[in-house]
């Protein structure tokens, strides 16, 4: 009996009745038995077919076996209702090989030609099975040339078996205190060959409790006890289980933290598994009771371990623990049944004691000492010399523990010095100087350091000067020893001031004309203000309409007197304003050089002379009366004139100040 | 305006108990409105907090881990003042040691004693 | 619990900001005080609650306090403001907690 080529040699080929393509003979029989190496099968077919027609192939037959099989008895040329002749079919192998047999009987009717067929090995699909049938792989089936092989899904493994996929089910560890954990693939069928443990793990104190929901189906067996797969619950105190069937075990409450759940599958069956929902009790804290003025949060029916809550306080009340006040407050339920920290009080806010205000004084309206929230203060300023600024001075002790104005500021109020207050009232025009009264010239200040000069009160804590007056003292102004509140030069009885800084303006250059002559001196205490110390006001915008020519100004100062001395006594002279181009013109001849009146200065004094401001004045103010505000205004500053004072044809030149408010209030602003 | 005056020994030996009193005027030891402490000094420690003595309808005292084990804070309301022992005393314990008392209003140690240097030496 | 952490020194020129820090982990959570020695004086409180100011403090010393870390922070510093200065909180066993301190030095 010929054999098929042996492997790995191309398995393919022909075979044919003996004599073809002429007639066979009577009482033949011949085997051929075809190998296709393993994972492969072999494919037959005819292309030409003429055997003697029997019933049932009795007779004359081709048989295809595939090992104890038969595939297919053949014969005529047709088939019938009984016979099968192969026609355009191909034929397979069940395994690697097929045999072919072929007989004829004794005799034949006529002449038959036989059969002609092809063969070939090719490759078994093993992934695609019949229906009805298991399927090769659990998961992935992957043919290749000559078999195949087996994958799983993410989450399984490929047991030894090379078909069944495991599910990678252990070492799960649940650690929250409610949860769901079911069999793998829930609510569909479980995998086979498996083993799954599952842990619930929770803090010491909490007790597990299992809920088995919606459906349990695990495969079971009526006379033996889970022997198939089965679900088993242990904790360090005792074991359940173990659970199959379709009947849904009843809750399990541990009165553990700590739960093994093992659920352990065989290689067969078709059923959904299980589900279960667990939660946890501890035992409960006390009930919270918020303290007066709080509330507590969340609210709950009870608190167990690990649950917290935490106290608010209403608006304008805090919190305070034991001694201390609190920004939050939570506290934790621990496993003996206890908080961890004591209830917390709410207690009033208490904005505590008010800033004293300088110049000023403050007032408990709500009560004598009441600091406590919605208490109300009220700032005042000290009459007559000092006004509030900004705001009405009534403040609240808000939730935030501030006392805060109506407008919302929390910072005091400023008591600022009323400005321009004199006890002179203007009369007809004076000629000649005047001995100053108490409280005629409050904002004259006398300016020692090294010669004697003179300065305005701006303010509580600034002077304003002439530039060349404090120039040899701009890098040391602790030198200048400041005096105020007193007429007389010599007196013992002044109030002292010291500089903290000077400012001399950056357009003024010493020794080349008198351009610019202004500075500031700041202080380094706030002066206290009354009838003898008030400042001096800056013009206002609309000042200008108050000094224009012929209108009188008044300069006081102690300087050099008709009789050539300093003047013991604080003297002043009420002089008219001089037109501009008349002052201009009266110093451009010599000795003065041309330009030596500019626009920053203005002039004033008589044409005749015998008024004018004079050495020892310069930095004091010239100062008008606003009659819309009733208050002095520094118009000008003394800064230079003619050798000899007061002399006739010749004038009293003085710094513009309303040219310099932008520079003033700069300087002040800054420092 | 509450005044704390310190009173005490500046020289103890080691192994031996510190003992410090503050005598208080312009308030009250048993006030429900403040707390009484002790605060120590030293260049290698800086501030150091110790303890505490306060009243609210009863006596409660709150000490400094660092010193748990060997601090007593006392209050004397019939002298108006409180007093801390420290016992067993080492070098360590040297330091400028102030009575300070705190606001419960405000949490600060808004009144400080004179300071007392105590230095542990044999 | 561990100490609040300062830096050891900080400098200013008169008229200038000085800005001096506390940090702790959550520090923000707590009210911090801030607490102003001069040598051989005992310390005076110039800060409570982050940001509120003793009676008798000047304005220019002002207070914040949010997540790790508070600040004291003193505008148009003086030079009598030259100091070492200490922040110090309570934490949750109310127990009193200090900084190391830091030096402010006006140039």
């Known amino acids: 009996t010929p054999l098929g080529p042996k492997w790995p040699e191309p398995v393919f080929g022909r075979l044919a009745s003996p004599g073809f393509p002429g007639e066979y003979a009577n009482d033949q029989e011949r085997r051929w038995t075809l190998t296709a190496p393993p994972g492969y099968r072999l494919r037959l077919y005819f292309t030409h077919f003429d055997l003697e027609l029997s019933h049932l192939c009795e007779y004359d037959f081709v048989k295809l076996s595939s090992g104890a099989k038969v595939l297919a008895t053949l014969c005529g040329q047709e088939s019938t209702d009984t016979e099968r002749a192969p026609g355009k079919d191909t034929f397979y192998s069940l395994g690697s090989s097929l045999d072919i047999t072929f007989r004829s009987d004794y005799s034949n009717e006529k002449p038959f030609t036989g059969f002609e067929a092809f063969y070939a090995a090719e490759d078994i699909d093993e992934c695609q099975v019949a229906p009805g049938e298991a399927p090769t792989c659990d998961h992935h089936c992957h043919n290749h040339l000559g078999g195949f092989y087996c994958s799983c899904r993410a989450g399984y493994v490929l047991h030894r078996n090379k078909r069944t996929c495991s599910a990678l089910c252990s070492g799960q560890v649940f650690t929250q205190r409610s949860g769901e954990l079911s069999s793998p693939e829930y609510p569909r069928p479980y995998p086979k060959l498996s083993s799954c443990t599952y842990s619930i793990s929770l803090e010491e104190g909490f007790s597990v409790i299992l809920d088995f929901v919606e459906s349990f189906d695990v495969e079971t067996h009526p006379e033996t006890l889970c022997p198939y797969d089965f679900l088993k619950i242990q904790t360090d105190r005792e074991e359940h289980g173990p659970f199959c069937g379709k009947t849904l075990p009843h809750r399990i409450e541990t009165k553990s933290n700590t739960v093994t759940i093992t659920f352990v599958t065989d290689e067969s069956g078709d059923h959904t598994g299980w589900k279960i929902h667990y939660t946890s009790t501890a035992q409960p804290c006390p009930y919270p009771m918020a303290p007066p003025n709080g509330h507590v949060s969340p609210v709950q029916a009870k608190y167990i371990l690990k649950d917290s809550f935490s106290i608010f306080c209403e608006t304008g009340y805090e919190l305070l623990q034991g001694h201390l006040p609190l920004k939050s407050f939570t506290a934790v339920c621990q496993k003996d049944g206890s908080w961890d920290r004591p209830m917390p009080a709410c207690s009033i806010v208490d904005c505590g004691p008010p800033d004293d205000l300088p110049s000023g004084r403050v007032e408990y309206i709500t009560g004598p000492g009441v600091t406590t929230y919605k208490a109300v203060i009220q700032y005042s300023c000290e009459e007559t010399f000092y006004t509030m600024k900004v705001n009405d001075g009534k403040y609240v002790c808000e939730a935030d523990g501030f006392w805060t104005s109506s407008k919302g500021e929390k910072s005091l109020p400023v008591c600022e010095p009323v400005c321009g207050l004199s006890a002179r009232t203007t009369g007809g025009r004076i000629y000649g100087g005047q001995k100053a009264k108490p409280g005629d010239f409050p904002w004259q200040v006398l300016i020692l350091g090294g010669t004697t000069a003179a300065g305005a009160l701006l303010y509580d804590n600034w002077v304003l000067t002439a530039a060349h007056a404090v120039y040899e003292q701009k890098h040391d102004a602790s030198a200048l020893d400041i005096r105020m509140g007193t007429l007389k030069r010599l007196s013992p009885h002044y109030t002292q001031a010291w500089s903290e800084a000077v400012f001399i303006h950056e357009g003024y250059t010493h020794d080349a004309g008198f351009d610019n002559d202004i500075a500031l001196i700041k202080l380094n205490n706030k002066v206290v203000i009354n009838s003898n110390i008030t400042p001096i006001c800056l013009p206002r915008k609309e000042a200008e309409s108050f000094m224009r020519t012929d209108d009188i100004g008044t300069a006081s100062g102690w300087g050099l007197t008709q009789r050539g001395f300093l003047a013991r006594n604080l003297m002043y002279v009420d002089i008219p304003i001089v037109d501009h181009q008349k002052c201009t013109a009266a110093y451009e001849k010599p000795p003065y050089p041309r330009g030596s009146v500019t626009a920053n200065m203005l002039c004033a004094g008589l044409e005749s002379g015998g008024k004018d401001s004079c050495r020892g004045d310069s930095g004091g103010a010239l100062v008008f009366l606003d009659s819309e505000t009733e208050r002095w205004f520094v118009g000008g500053i003394v800064s230079w004139g003619s050798m000899n004072c007061g002399e006739a044809g010749q004038y009293g030149v003085y710094t513009k100040v309303i040219n310099y408010i932008p520079w003033i209030e700069n300087i002040i602003s800054d420092f | 305006e509450v005044q704390l005056q310190q009173s005490g020994p500046g020289l103890v030996k080691p192994s031996q108990t510190l003992s410090l009193t503050c005598a208080i005027s312009?308030?009250?030891?048993?006030?429900?409105?403040?707390?009484w402490d002790w605060i120590r000094q030293s260049p290698s420690r800086g501030l150091e907090w110790l303890g505490r003595?306060?009243?609210?309808?009863?006596?409660?005292?709150d000490y400094a881990i660092s010193v748990k084990s060997r601090i007593t804070i006392n209050a004397d309301t019939s002298r108006n003042q409180f007093s801390l022992q420290l016992n067993s005393v080492t070098p360590e314990d040297t330091a400028v040691y102030y009575c300070?008392?705190?606001?419960?209003?405000?949490?600060?140690?808004?009144?400080w004693g004179q300071g007392t240097l105590v230095t542990v030496s044999s | 619990q561990p100490g609040l952490t300062q830096p050891p020194s900080v400098s200013v020129s008169p008229g200038q900001t000085a800005r001096i820090t506390c940090s702790r982990d959550k520090l923000g959570d707590k009210y911090v005080s801030w607490y102003q020695q001069k040598p051989g004086q005992s310390p005076v409180v110039v800060m409570y609650?982050?940001?509120k100011r003793p009676s008798g403090i000047p304005e220019r010393f002002s207070g914040s306090n949010s997540g790790n870390t508070a600040t004291l922070t003193i505008s148009g510093t003086q030079a009598m403001d030259e100091a070492d200065y200490y922040c110090q909180a309570w934490d949750s066993s109310t127990a009193g907690v200090f900084g190391g301190g830091t030096k402010l030095t006006v140039l």
């Open positions: 300070v008392k705190s606001n419960s209003g405000t949490g600060a140690f808004d009144s």
């Open positions: 609650k982050d940001n």
């Open positions: 003595t306060y009243y609210r309808s009863k006596w409660f005292n």
């Open positions: 312009g308030d009250s030891v048993s006030s429900k409105r403040a707390a």
